[in-house]
């Protein structure tokens, strides 16, 4: 015998209290597949979350984050605070990158400047809290007559700036 509930389409549930009649999902609930015996409660997007897609009888609501925060996790399960470029997020809030590190995004951690000398290159543009150093040609390429550009002073050794 075929289960009568298998005939209930998405957006309905098989109501055991009414002789397994297919009943529409109540407000603020949904069923995304047929043959369901219950409807699922719609996700509520509130506070740090905002609604990206409204709940319908056949699909759950989708949330993103209120401006000032960004999504983390599958389906935007969490919202995390944005910081400014040149900062990283800590439990104490947004903090400036330490000297010798940078972050060019509103999220993520401060990363060390590229060490140009490891590639046998010189520093063409010094790094900042927001930008990595730009490595230039190797010092050997800058022999007299090879270029009229005066190489800048090398960047200071990374150290911690006061917070």
């Amino acid at each position: 015998l075929q289960d009568p509930c298998s005939n209930c389409p998405a957006g309905t549930f098989c109501d055991n209290n009414r002789n397994q009649i297919c009943s529409p999902c109540p407000p603020n609930s949904f069923s995304s597949a047929g043959g369901q015996r219950t409807c699922d409660i719609c996700r509520q997007c509130k506070g740090v979350f905002r609604t990206r897609k409204e709940c319908s009888s056949t699909s759950n609501a989708e949330c993103d984050c209120t401006p000032g925060f960004h999504c983390l996790g599958a389906g935007c399960s969490m919202c995390e605070q944005d910081c400014k470029q040149g900062q990283e997020l800590t439990k104490k809030g947004c903090k400036d990158c330490c000297f010798g590190t940078f972050n060019d995004q509103k999220r993520g951690i401060c990363r060390p400047w590229t060490n140009c000398s490891l590639d046998g290159k010189s520093v063409l543009v010094n790094g900042t809290k927001e930008r990595d150093v730009v490595c230039g040609p190797s010092p050997a390429d800058l022999s007299p007559g090879a270029s009229s550009v005066t190489p800048p002073a090398p960047a200071r050794e990374p150290g911690h700036s006061p917070q």
């Epitope: 506070g47 740090v48 925060f69 983390l72 996790g73 399960s77 969490m78 919202c79 995390e80 605070q81 997020l89 800590t90 439990k91």
Partner: nanobody
Framework: QVQLQESGGGLVQPGGSLRLSCAAT?????NYWMNWVRQAPGKGLEW???????????YYVDSVKGRFTISRDNAKNSLYLQMSSLRAEDTAVYFC????????????????SGQGTTVTVSS
Amino acid sequence: QVQLQESGGGLVQPGGSLRLSCAATGFTLSNYWMNWVRQAPGKGLEWVANINQDGSERYYVDSVKGRFTISRDNAKNSLYLQMSSLRAEDTAVYFCARGGEGYGVDHYGLDVSGQGTTVTVSS
């Protein structure tokens, strides 16, 4: 169902005080970092303060340091924000929000928040 419900907002004069409360239901508050965030009219969301599970660590955005105090009563499953020396720029909707699993280790994401309570500072 996991829920947070804020209360205690209202109209207050500059220099005045308010105490916001947040009641947690459907989960054990003592297992989570908790946060207050706010949204001023026409602005983005701003993190205000957080507190760790047992209340031994508390951190604040610079603009409220020395004026706001975050606290919690795990026995009552409640979070609080005592606000004093209020300024016009503190006018906002205030939300309490739970730190998600792994908060402070892998991320600083918030996974549950309430509907908010409105604080208006005006003479």
